[in-house]
């Protein structure tokens, strides 16, 4: 598959996972910022990554998860809802060596993570702390509590066009 | 669609070594972690151990360590179990089983149909 | 290790009939229970995840729930396929453990 980036001729190879959808053909940058590709008429902003009809935005500036589900909020998207397998496989294969903040928040009362789509999250979340209610992915090969008031970069994430 | 298949019956005398394997297909192999499952003729199911198959460490159930080792053949998408030493108490049928680490949902959803091991001088 | 205490290991019930099978956990395993069917040739297919959540394809006379350490598996209406062996699994923590298994039989 292809994931599109900031590369010369408007998009990059990466490593295939299986039930990524298939891009063909071409693309190219349009002069709104969009880059295509010409077969699905799919499209990402520029700067964001695509996979299976989705967009990505890895930042590179830092804030608090609060700060971070607002700026997502700005661009038209939401925290980053990490919530297969092969999508966490695809976002740890194109983050750096940093803490991004998720869409994944503890909810005290339930003793439970939920997505911010409320639904539930069965799952391993390393690092848990009773002052850690938000996560973060980017540095192991899971899920990180982290404190909601200390800065990380952050993944957005939205409907590709 | 995901399958696991798994490498047909075996026929093994006391002392020999056996070697089974579950290819899997359908989905990305390294993503997932591979448990392995004994199963005595007429009893219940017990639980091996799991390997995991980005980094290819395994971890074994108490009554495994020893005589069992999982492997890997990450380009073939592959997963072995091998047995050294059989004992007639090996004879049984084993499965793989797919399973996340992270995602519990996703633990144990695909099972390989199973190899028949006969252990008998 | 957590002991799975599956109940009971036979059943003999009659098409249409509604029957349910019962895992008790020796801790506390949460939400993390399968429930597995196997059919006479081996096939082990899961039905339940996470308590009380459908496999795709199962068919919606299946269902799982849980009472503080019990968990349940119901067959609201039995068809002549349901009649196999049933397993309940705990991923809460390792080792991994099974329970004993039911075998439903058509009465």
């Known amino acids: 598959p292809q994931i599109f980036n900031k590369s010369n001729d408007g998009f990059t190879t990466t490593r295939s996972y299986g039930t990524v959808s298939q891009i063909f053909g071409s693309s190219s940058p349009s002069p709104n910022g969009f880059i295509t590709t010409r077969s699905y008429g799919t499209v990402c902003p520029k700067d964001w990554e695509f996979y299976q009809a989705r967009c990505f935005f890895l930042s590179t500036s830092e804030s608090s998860w609060n700060e971070s589900r607002d700026f997502c909020k700005g661009k038209g998207s939401t925290l980053a809802i990490v919530n297969t397998p092969e999508k966490l496989k695809f976002l740890q294969d194109i983050t750096d060596a940093e803490k991004y903040f998720i869409g994944l928040i503890y909810h005290r009362e339930e003793k439970r993570w939920r997505w911010i789509n409320n639904s539930v999250f069965n799952g391993n979340v390393t690092n848990q702390n009773q002052n850690f209610n938000c996560a973060t992915i980017g540095l192991t090969k899971t899920f990180d509590a982290a404190s909601c008031d200390i800065s990380y970069r952050r993944i957005c994430e939205k409907n590709a066009k | 669609q995901i399958q696991l298949v798994q490498s047909g019956p075996e026929l093994k005398k006391p002392g020999e070594t056996v070697k089974i394997s579950c290819k899997a297909s359908g989905y990305t192999f390294t993503i997932y972690a591979m448990n392995w499952v004994k199963q005595a003729p007429g009893k219940g199911l017990e639980w091996m151990g799991w390997?995991?198959?980005?980094?290819?460490?395994?971890t074994y159930a108490d009554d495994f360590k020893g005589r069992f080792a999982f492997s890997l053949e990450t380009s073939a998408s592959t997963a072995y179990l091998q047995i050294n030493n059989l004992k007639n108490e090996d004879m049984a049928t084993y499965f793989c089983a797919r399973s996340s680490e992270v995602f519990y949902d996703y633990r144990f959803d695909y099972w390989g149909q199973g190899t028949a091991l006969t252990v008998s001088s | 290790d957590i002991q799975m205490t599956q109940s009971p290991s036979s059943l003999s019930a009659s098409l249409g009939e509604r029957v349910s099978l019962t895992c008790r956990a020796s801790?506390?395993?949460?939400?993390?229970l399968n429930w597995l069917q196997q059919e006479p040739d081996g096939t082990i297919k899961r039905l339940i995840y996470a308590t009380s959540n459908l496999d795709s394809g199962v068919p919606k006379r299946f269902s799982g729930s849980r009472s503080g350490s019990d968990y349940s598996l119901t067959i609201s209406s039995l068809e002549s396929e349901d009649f196999v062996h049933y397993y309940c699994?705990?991923?809460?923590?390792?080792?991994?453990?099974f329970g004993s298994g039911t075998k439903l039989e058509i009465k």
């Open positions: 699994l705990q991923y809460a923590s390792s080792p991994f453990t």
């Open positions: 390997i995991n198959t980005d980094t290819g460490e395994p």
């Open positions: 801790q506390d395993i949460g939400s993390s």
